[in-house]
């Protein structure tokens, strides 16, 4: 009896694992084995596919074959008993294009109200992703074990910390990788669960802010208790993106080590131009708090987030405000190439009651004004990145009178 060729061959590639699956064409014929050949682009000859010769099952692994993952290859399969079937050719494919990103490795650390997630590629020193290893981003789904309500967090790097959790609570999460440059989304990791610790005696410092005074940075934070000492550490922000890095070498700010106030002052030249992360820890001599939430600190923005400049066009019942770039000395506009939101405060000149508008646009309408009334306006800029959390000082107030009642159009 003639053997039929196997059919429906599927190639599954996850990271560096190459798996072939196929269907037997004739279930009634026993003791059949299967063999594959492969052919590289531009070659005429077929080569035996090692790991996939004389296979009795309908699955084989050819991960040991050292292929150029960017080069197209073609496969063929046949069945063998006393005789052989004809070859069945599989559509040619490029391994890299076909490959899926496997589940990442996940390691969790617990604090009382936070979880630290360390993520690394599932396959160490992967050949498939050798050129893309630095481009991995991750997303995760996290939920309280007791409730199952899921929260998604996108675009995180190899270390991520989730804050504002409840003590002594089990949280579960799963993580997947993505290579946005290649439009690839990976497979979720297994679910990992961890229980946050009992509440720490000392809470971490909160509301960390950096401002500039003269040639110094002033770092301020809030703390619940008195008679504490604090230390402040910094880290280059880009190090968080380094996938091979499990040790973050946070450094002390010398003038902010063992300070007894909820602020410290240090010279601007401590930091070269760049983006840093800052964190603060409290201690009472016996106990130490967990570290505060990390804030992002950009020396450029810190030094140069200037108040906005604006013009007012007065109507009878509204102001139209046009916000422009702030001016440096010499009247040249400052290019601020990061997204800002504007906070506009206005009030009737004869009153203290302030009203506020928050706008992303640079042309803003202040509505519901009374005709022939003097109103004053001041504005400031905020960075839109929640981690930078930087604000300019307010501009000087500008006061204008609204037009008479019939000029609202």
């Amino acid at each position: 009896k003639n053997l039929k060729s196997p059919q429906k061959v599927e190639v599954d590639i996850i990271d560096d694992n190459f798996i072939l699956r196929w269907n037997r064409s004739d279930e009634s014929v026993g003791n059949v084995t299967f063999s594959f050949d492969y052919q590289k682009t531009g070659m005429d000859n077929w080569i035996k596919l090692s790991g996939c010769q004389n296979i009795t099952s309908t699955k084989c692994n050819f991960s040991s074959l050292k292929l150029n993952v960017y080069e197209e290859i073609k496969l063929r399969i046949r069945a063998e008993k006393e005789n052989t079937s004809s070859w069945y050719e599989v559509d040619s494919f490029t391994p890299f294009r076909k490959a899926q990103i496997g589940p990442p490795e996940v390691h969790l650390e617990a604090e009382d109200k936070a979880i630290v997630i360390h993520i690394s590629p599932g396959t160490k020193d992967s050949v498939m992703w050798a050129l893309d290893g630095l481009s991995f981003t991750y997303s995760l789904v996290i939920w309280k074990n007791s409730s199952g309500v899921e929260e998604r967090i996108e675009n995180i790097y190899s270390r991520h910390k989730i804050y504002k959790l409840s003590p002594e609570t089990t949280y579960c999460l799963k993580v997947k990788a993505a290579l946005l440059t290649s439009w690839k989304i990976g497979v979720y990791s297994p679910v990992h669960c961890i229980k946050t610790t009992v509440e720490n005696e000392l809470p971490p410092p909160e509301n960390i802010e950096v401002s500039v005074q003269n040639q110094n940075y002033v770092l301020k934070w809030d703390y619940t208790y008195a008679n504490m000492t604090f230390q402040v550490q910094w880290l280059h922000a880009f190090l968080k993106r380094n996938p091979g890095n499990h040790l973050y070498k946070w450094k002390q700010i010398p003038d902010c080590e063992n300070v007894k106030t909820t602020q410290c002052v240090f010279p601007q030249n401590v930091f070269q131009k760049g983006i840093y992360l800052l964190r603060v820890q409290a201690s009472d001599g016996n106990n130490t708090s967990f570290w505060s939430e990390e804030i992002k600190f950009d020396t450029e923005i810190q030094a140069f987030l200037l108040p906005p400049v604006f013009n007012i066009r007065s109507l009878s019942d509204s102001f139209h405000i046009y916000i422009g770039a702030p001016k440096q000395s010499g009247n040249t506009p400052v290019i601020q190439d990061y997204p800002l939101i504007y906070e506009i405060i206005f009030w009737e000149n004869t009153s203290n009651a302030e009203r506020k508008i928050i706008e992303k646009k640079t042309d803003v309408t202040v509505p519901n004004l009374k005709p022939l009334t003097v109103y004053c306006v001041k504005a400031r800029a905020h960075t839109m990145d929640e981690k930078l959390n930087k604000s300019s000082v307010f501009s000087d107030a500008v006061c204008e009178k609204t037009k008479p009642g019939n000029t609202s159009k």
């Epitope: 630290v116 961890i194 610790t197 890095n245 499990h246 040790l247 070498k249 450094k251």
Partner: antibody, heavy 118, light 107 residues
């Protein structure tokens, strides 16, 4: 493979100093911290301090501050522990260990026995 | 400094027994605890890091659990090569500290 190889046993007189070495191989010493731990005969482990070989930043246990000095030479992948004003209770084994963030001390040297005797 | 206590200080057991060693810290250290095994004349051998993760090559009979101030090392079925001293270690804040050790010997 990753290894930490420590210098050989030392015999010193009280009041003298000793400098021990710990050579790393199979990894870049600049990417880690190197810690030093002491162990008296039949006793437990006691942390002395650590160095960041990349910039020579050090931390010490208060007990050893001023008497222990940890240094590193990244060009030869080696960290050092120098102990001054040796006393007879410094007759212990000193271990170096590689610190790898949440992996803690994942590799240790074989230990160096220092004997202080007059 | 963070103080660490370990119990028991010594334990006589037989091959095949299940053994539990506990470690208490004087303050919350999150999950920053490691466990090491040491045999006479040898360097400590890393067993568990970050409270519950086994180092590569460590047999699955060793497991760690706990968080905050209370930590446990469990050997599910003691083997002849497990008779040694076990130390816990906190690496939450400086100065780092070790527990006094638990000596496991043959009954």
């Amino acid at each position: 493979q990753v290894q930490l190889v420590q210098s050989g046993a030392e015999v010193k007189k009280p009041g003298a100093s000793v400098k021990l070495s710990c050579k790393g191989s199979g990894f870049n010493i600049k990417d880690y911290y190197i810690h030093w731990v002491k162990q008296a005969p039949g006793q437990g482990l006691e942390w002395i301090g650590r160095i960041d070989p990349e910039d020579a930043e050090t931390k010490y246990a208060p007990k050893f501050q001023g008497r222990a000095t940890i240094t590193a030479d990244t060009s030869i992948s080696t960290a050092y522990l120098e102990l001054s004003r040796l006393r007879s209770d410094d007759t212990v084994v000193y271990y170096c260990g590689r610190y790898h963030g949440y992996w803690a001390l994942d590799y240790w040297g074989q230990g160096t026995l220092v004997t202080v005797s007059s | 400094d963070i103080q660490m206590t370990q119990s028991p200080s010594s334990l006589s057991t037989s091959v095949g027994d299940r053994v539990t060693v506990t470690c208490k810290t004087s303050q919350n250290v999150g999950t920053n605890v490691a466990w090491y095994q040491q045999k006479p004349g040898k360097a400590p051998k890393p067993l568990i890091y970050s409270t519950s993760y086994r180092y590569s090559g460590v047999p699955s009979r060793f497991s760690g659990s706990g968080s905050g101030t209370d930590f446990t090392l469990t050997i599910s079925s003691v083997q002849p090569e497990d008779f040694a001293t076990y130390y816990c270690h906190q690496y939450f804040s400086y100065p780092y500290t070790f527990g006094p050790g638990t000596k496991l010997d043959i009954k």
